[in-house]
Every structure is written in structure tokens, then in C-alpha cells.
């Protein structure tokens, strides 16, 4: 009973988490204009993974997609990839876990098969959650770096009194949705892995048979098979950073550097 509850809860938590990852990936508010120095702007900028938007005081909102692939920063591409991988793994995990649920009977599926499927889906949820958390964290780090870079040269003097205020971006709602969703998927995955241990048969369906010898008594009890899975991680962290060097064409072309972070 506890195993079924753990498995079911793990499935529901993962489902909510993956829905959240999908929502975060689609959201436009990954980064929003920092209003610290200008709380009463009549033009509010915010950006997502796929497009940047401007909401005007008039109520009009204009969004433009990033119609270039090669022109986008490598970090943004990496974040997109991580989120998509997270969604794909999560979706496959959900599909597998549906068939693995103890409360669902499919033909004469063995408990060992269900245990393996539960473990597989659990691992997929864990990786999916980690992908989402990593993606959101990479984007957040990119925002922090650019925030302090733009703060350093926030006001560029243009002949005395005139000032050009550079738009700074801060964390958008999508980042928090992504972190929470990734965490939920991760927790759901862990729960599925825990449930797997309870599903795996500790002993065979045959009763233990005792053989009584004349001199001494020996009981033979066939033992259950336990499978352990080990994970090896050999991820190399490579810092990809765009120092801000731009060709003349890049400076003039739309979208600008600040449209993605």
C-alpha cells in the first residue's frame, strides 16, 4: 500500500513538475526590465527564450521572435537545449511511469518489470529536473553577470547633461517557475526510485522448502535478486562567455545583444 502511494505521489509530483517546466520554457518573462532606477517607466521590456516583448503604458504589447539561430548567444542556445531535453525526458518518463503504476494492470506484467519501469521513469524524472534546474541556473547566472556589467557602465555621458540609460534586466517569473518545477520533477523522480525498491520482489513466488537430514537440519531459502544501478558523471564545465566584442554589422542588426539576457 505504501509503495503504491509513494509511486502514485511520485507520478503526480513529476507530472506537475514537468507541466511547470513546459510552462517555464514557453513563458516570455525569463528576464524583466530592472525598475530600480526607473520605477515609473512607460515602456516595460521583458524577454523569454524564444522572443522579447515590450509592454507600453497604453496597454499595447509587442513581441518579436528571435528569428535567427546562429546569431543567438551560445548560452541562450544551451539553456534552450537543456529545457527541451528536460521536457523530452520528462515526457518519456511520464509515459513509462503510467505503465509502471501498480494500480494499473496491463496484461500479466511482472512486478519485476514494473519495478524496472518505475526505476527507469524515476531516473528520467531526476535527469529532467536537473536539466531544468541547470538551464534556469545558467540563465540566471548570465543575467547576474550582465546586470553587474551594465551597472558598471550604466550611464554613458553624451556631452554634458545628456544621459543614455542602458536597460538592465533582472530575474523574471519564469526562472522561479523553472526552479520550482525542476525541483518537483526531481523529488518526483526520487519518490519513483524509492517506490521501485518496494516493487522489486525480495523473494520468488515459490514457498521455501525445508529438507530434513538425519544428522542436522539445513534450510534452503532461495534468495531474491536485487539489481543496483550506478551512475558515473564526467561532466566538464566549460565557461562560455561573450566579452562584448561586436562587429559593426552585429551592432546594427536586430535583435541587439541585450535582447536575450
Amino acid at each position: 500500500m505504501a509503495v503504491t502511494a509513494c509511486q502514485g505521489l511520485g507520478f503526480v509530483v513529476s507530472l506537475i513538475g514537468i507541466a511547470g517546466i513546459i510552462a517555464a520554457t514557453c513563458m516570455d518573462q525569463w528576464s524583466t526590465q530592472d525598475l530600480y532606477n526607473n520605477p515609473v517607466t512607460a515602456v516595460f521590456n521583458y524577454q523569454g527564450l524564444w522572443r522579447s516583448c515590450v509592454r507600453e503604458s497604453s496597454g499595447f504589447t509587442e513581441c518579436r521572435g528571435y528569428f535567427t539561430l546562429l546569431g543567438l548567444p551560445a548560452m541562450l542556445q544551451a539553456v534552450r537545449a537543456l529545457m527541451i531535453v528536460g521536457i523530452v525526458l520528462g515526457a518519456i518518463g511520464l509515459l513509462v511511469s503510467i505503465f509502471a503504476l501498480k494500480c494499473i494492470r496491463i496484461g500479466s506484467m511482472e512486478d519485476s518489470a514494473k519495478a524496472n519501469m518505475t526505476l527507469t521513469s524515476g531516473i528520467m524524472f531526476i535527469v529532467s529536473g536537473l536539466c531544468a534546474i541547470a538551464g534556469v541556473s545558467v540563465f540566471a547566472n548570465m543575467l547576474v553577470t550582465n546586470f553587474w556589467m551594465s551597472t558598471a557602465n550604466m550611464y554613458t555621458g553624451m556631452g554634458g547633461m545628456v544621459q543614455t540609460v542602458q536597460t538592465r534586466y533582472t530575474f523574471g517569473a519564469a526562472l522561479f517557475v523553472g526552479w520550482v518545477a525542476g525541483g518537483l520533477t526531481l523529488i518526483g523522480g526520487v519518490m519513483m526510485c524509492i517506490a521501485c525498491r518496494g516493487l522489486a520482489p525480495e523473494e520468488t513466488n515459490y514457498k521455501a522448502v525445508s529438507y530434513h537430514a538425519s544428522g542436522h537440519s539445513v534450510a534452503y531459502k532461495p534468495g531474491g535478486f536485487k539489481a543496483s544501478t550506478g551512475f558515473g558523471s564526467n561532466t566538464k564545465n566549460k565557461k562560455i562567455y561573450d566579452g562584448g566584442a561586436r562587429t559593426e554589422d552585429e551592432v546594427q542588426s536586430y535583435p541587439s545583444k541585450h535582447d536575450y539576457v
Epitope: 526590465q33 526607473n38 515609473v40 517607466t41 512607460a42 515602456v43 521590456n45 524577454q47 522579447s52 516583448c53 515590450v54 507600453e56 503604458s57 497604453s58 496597454g59 499595447f60 509587442e62 518579436r64 545628456v162 544621459q163 543614455t164 540609460v165 542602458q166 536597460t167 536586430y254 541587439s256 541585450h258 535582447d259
Partner: antibody
Amino acid sequence: EVMLVESGGDLVKPGGSLKLSCAASGFTFSTYTMSWVRQTPEKRLEWVATIVGGGGYTYYLDSVKGRFTISRDNAKNTLYLQMISLRSEDTALYYCARMGLTQRNALDYWGQGTSITVSS
Amino acid sequence: DIVMTQSPSSLSVSEGEKVTLNCKSSQSLFNSGNQKNYLAWYQQKPGQPPKLLIYGASTRESGVPDRFTGSGFGTDFTLTISSVQAEDLAVYYCQNDHTYPLTFGAGAKLELK
């Protein structure tokens, strides 16, 4: 045809109060952000206050903050400006204006204005 | 607050003449998010409310004659009337539409010579 008609202007004593109204017609009032702009006797234009379509956000000129309140009744298609603690520098012709949806926050339609004179 | 400075404050012109009115803002009115400049130009004739001519620094409002042209970027903007007509004699105001308070320039009065 878009029409904005202001009313409520009067001669008031310093410290007095007044409520201006602006009746709108010819467009879906609730969709548009509305503003009050005043023109001083020296013919200078001065933005006073803005209220967004749903009424959730309001913006004010610093010198009128706490004294003026912009509000709207979308059911009656009417914009209001409640003014208290009036000063002599509030003497002006008050215009009600509509912020165009696709006009980059520019005021695309204006009323004929209502005059306020603050004098003892 | 963003200060809008207009020049000249008044201008005497002959009919058919080309006129250039300038407007300078103390801060950039350019928005990087959509690559637009948030500046408007208005025309006010005696006894009438202001009328929108140009928005987004260069977009002509519908119904405005094509002799009116807006240009500029960031902090420096221009309103050009290619061939002044008698009906163009009025006061012209520029306005910051980027940041509250939405400040106006002092105006430029166009008079007949």
C-alpha cells in the same frame, strides 16, 4: 467618431477642491489608457496623471501626488480627476486625452478642455 | 525627470519655405527592447487642443499631410515641414513618451513673415 468632453472647471479658492469629469464616446473606453494634461496660462503643456485601461495602475506628476486622484468608471465611460488642496499654480486649462494603443504612448485624441482658476 | 528642450522657440517663415524644428531630451528616449524611440510631436492652433502629428519619433499619424516628417534617435529629434502652408502656422510641441512624468517641450511658435 472619438469624442472627449471635459466638465467641472470652476473658479476656486486656494486650499479648495474640485472634481473634473471627462465623458468619452466613439471608442471602447475600458481598453484605453487615459490621461489628464494641463496647459498653463503661459501656454506650457504639463502632463498631470495617467490611468491604465483596467484602472489598476495610476501615475502622477510629483507636484500633484497626494492632492490629485485620477479614476475611471468604465461602465459610464467617464474619466475623473479629484483635486484637493488646490494651489494658485494649478490654474490651467485641463485636457482629458486618450493614449493611442499603437501610437507608442502618444496622446492621439484630446478634449476641448475645462478651465480651472485658483485665486483668492 | 526628462527635460525636453525645443529650438527655436519661435520662427518667422514664408509660405512654401522648408522649416526644421529641433527637440533635445536630457535622457535617451530609445528603447532597446523594440528598437523604437518614444517621442511625439503635436500641433496646437489658437483656441484648439493639441493634435498628434508624429509618434515614435518618425511615424506620421493618420490624416497628417506628408509634408510633415519626423526624424531623430536617442536624444536628438527633428520635425521638418517641407513646404509650409498657411494652415501650418501654430505652436509645435515635442513630448517624451518613454518615462513618467511624460514631459513636454516649451513649444516652438511658427509665424508668418
